[in-house]
């Protein structure tokens, strides 16, 4: 027989199947061109001295063989004596160590047996009821396929899975979705219902992120508030990168995790926009306001868990920057203007109360007045800062109030509301003898002292009721006691105390009468 033909004679070895565990298996035959065909198989066991024979039986019952030698692949033409248009049965017999080993048989029509293409082009990935759904367009003119997938994680080997039979212009596969690790998938196809048909090559890798994007493990730090009333938010620790399977390393579209920074400005609730979402790489400048910051991780399946932080307000105060004048019509604040056409947000809240009770007012865009000052006025009827208590005031400014990251802090200070001069009057003034010509005057702290920076000083006034002479003694705002000396025994005096702010003189306390008793010597 010629080597290119299927030999219709008995093969050159005895016909006996050893039934051993080793031997030829996984025979695949398919058409490789208009007139050529190929069969390939695997051989399990020691290969030394093994001779392979491809056996073929026609539907007529006649059988022939090709001698392949030690090769496990053999090509033949449609003129080799094998009927390609009709069903044939093929198997491999391997002659080794004086015994014959036989592969399982495959029965097929060679003419129609073509090797399919793997899924080509765009493979769409989505999540369906906790599983992964892959979908792709069936390669043209190859409808009717059996599809398999294989998948691996960074730490596990390939695992094989079945997609089942497909018979449409689009094919799809349901695959397992890992919760916390990325996966690499590959798909392959073969003719449906054709025994012994050959699998296509594996498709290009499909890289799939975990169902849950990794929780961002990042840390922030906030710089000091600068002269411009802004402070930089900086990232101390980058988010950890997702570990990828081998075929997804480098460029792995599909597994990307995007981290976004969500800023929520808690201060100044009357502004138009309270939240802004930014890319994590672009770290913003913030005002001195209080913020909540969240880092949100998301992948193609949506957002994951987020990590949140609270950035407290910068409480550094500048007591001299704000001027407040109280008139009959109402109250006006003045402060150094930032620039032309600025919108200001004035926020106030009673000291010692929850931050949620802050009130604020937004000004229309304003230019500085001739003295370079910006102003905000309110009437008594408005009730703003009307109660006689300490308020914490912060003023923010922005040329673009709709942009959350462009606000800056102008100043933070304290203000005592209502009728501060009356409310601040010291009470419980008491006089105690100190020596033969002096007394100690004590009083309860003024309500103004609860308001840092508001109380400028106490003034103690002593009046000689005989001569009508008056002396005034300034006292540090931290003190609530003063010694009056140079007094004369037997003379009646009255003492009063007032509390002054930088812009307001206080109201005198009720006069307190006293005298130093004349000492009678024995």
């Amino acid at each position: 027989c010629r080597t290119s033909e299927c030999c219709f004679q008995d093969p050159p070895y005895p016909d006996a199947d050893s039934g051993s565990a080793s031997g030829p298996r996984d025979l695949r035959c398919y058409r490789i061109s208009s007139d050529r065909y190929e069969c390939s198989w695997q051989y399990e066991g020691p290969t030394a001295g093994v001779s392979h024979f491809l056996r073929c039986c026609l539907s007529s019952g006649r059988c022939c063989y090709f001698a392949a030698g030690s090769a496990t692949r053999l090509q033949f033409s449609d003129q080799a004596g094998v009927s390609v248009l009709y069903t044939v049965t093929l198997w491999v017999e391997s002659w080794a160590r004086n015994q014959t080993e036989k592969s399982p048989e495959v029965t097929l029509q060679l003419y129609n047996s073509v090797k399919y293409e793997p899924p080509l082009g765009d493979i769409k990935v989505s999540k369906l009821a906790g599983q992964l759904r892959m979908e792709w367009e069936t390669p043209d003119n190859q409808v009717g396929a059996e599809v398999q997938f294989r998948h691996r994680t960074p730490s596990s080997p390939w695992k094989l899975g079945d997609c089942g039979p497909q018979d449409d212009d689009t094919e799809s596969c349901l695959c397992p979705l890992e919760m916390n690790v990325a996966q690499e998938f590959q798909l392959r196809r073969r003719q449906l219902g054709s025994q012994g048909s050959s699998w296509s090559k594996w498709s290009s890798p499909v890289c799939v992120p975990p169902e849950n994007p990794p929780q961002p493990q990042v840390r922030f730090s906030v710089e000091q508030l600068g002269q411009d009333g802004r402070r930089r938010l900086t990232l101390k620790e980058q988010p950890t990168q997702l570990e990828l399977p081998e075929g997804c390393q480098g460029l792995a579209p599909g597994t990307e995790v995007t981290y976004r920074l969500q800023l929520h400005m808690l201060s100044c609730p009357c502004k138009a926009k309270a939240t802004r979402t930014l890319h994590l790489g672009k770290m913003p400048y913030l005002s001195g306001a209080a913020y909540n910051v969240a880092v949100i991780s998301s992948n193609q399946f949506g957002p994951g868990l987020n990590q949140t932080w609270h950035i407290p307000a910068d409480t550094h105060t500048e007591p001299v920057a704000l001027n407040i004048s109280v008139g009959t019509n109402g109250t006006t604040m003045y402060w150094p203007a930032r620039a032309q056409s600025m919108t200001y947000c004035i926020e106030w809240q009673p000291v010692g109360q929850d931050g949620g009770l802050a009130t604020c007012s937004l000004t229309a865009p304003q230019d500085p007045d001739p003295a370079g000052m910006a102003t905000y006025s309110w009437s008594r009827e408005s009730g703003a800062m009307g109660q006689e208590k300490c308020y914490y005031i912060t003023i923010f400014a922005s040329a673009h109030p709709e942009k959350l990251t462009l606000w800056s802090t102008v100043l933070s200070t304290y203000h005592f509301g209502g009728n501060a001069s009356a409310a601040g009057t010291p009470h419980h003034v008491s006089v105690k003898n100190h020596s033969l010509d002096s007394v100690s005057v004590d009083w309860a702290p003024s309500l103004l002292s609860t308001c840092p920076g508001v109380l400028k000083e106490y003034v103690v006034r002593c009046r000689d009721e005989d001569s009508k002479q008056v002396s005034e003694h300034p006292v540090q705002p931290t003190e609530t006691q003063v010694t009056l000396s140079g007094l004369r025994a037997g003379v009646a005096y009255t003492v009063q105390v007032r509390a002054d702010t930088a812009w307001l003189r206080g109201v005198w306390s009720q006069p307190q009468r006293f005298s130093i008793e004349v000492q009678v010597s024995d």
């Epitope: 248009l85 003419y111 129609n112 073509v114 003119n141 212009d169």
Partner: nanobody, 127 residues
Framework: EVQLVESGGGLVQTGGSLRLSCAAS????????MGWFRQTPGKEREFVGE??????????ADSVKGRFTISRANAKNTITMYLQMSSLKSEDTAVYYC??????????????????WGQGTQVTVSS
């Protein structure tokens, strides 16, 4: 559903050449193969040749081998199959039909393997 329309038939001298076209439209992605058959009055349809679409593998009847060539071109949702005929003989005179199948089994020369057929185009070879 697939529609097939042939064109290009006509009168040609012995030894001459002619190119037939068959335009397939509709769900052409489901097709496995397209073929040419011919029929003369009072006779069965005779297989001429076939092309496996996904691989461009061709197969011809012995009577036309070496003289006829089948090819195809793809456009969006349309496949055009061609039959280039050269060295024409008077016995090539017939109505030429285009056929298409969407199953992977069966003998290419059997008419019952094909689900879709064109209306035919006349080829006359005169001496």
């Amino acid at each position: 559903e697939v529609q097939l329309v042939e064109s290009g038939g006509g009168l040609v001298q012995t030894g001459g050449s002619l190119r037939l076209s068959c335009a397939a439209s509709g769900r052409t992605s489901r097709l496995v193969a397209m073929g040419w058959f011919r029929q003369t009055p009072g006779k069965e349809r005779e297989f001429v040749g076939e092309i496996i679409l996904s691989k461009d593998f061709t197969y011809y009847a012995d009577s036309v081998k070496g003289r006829f060539t089948i090819s195809r071109a793809n456009a969006k949702n349309t496949i055009t199959m061609y039959l280039q005929m050269s060295s024409l003989k008077s016995e090539d005179t017939a109505v030429y039909y285009c056929a298409a199948r969407q199953n992977w089994s069966g003998h290419p020369a059997r008419t019952n393997e094909y689900e879709y057929w064109g209306q035919g185009t006349q080829v006359t070879v005169s001496s």
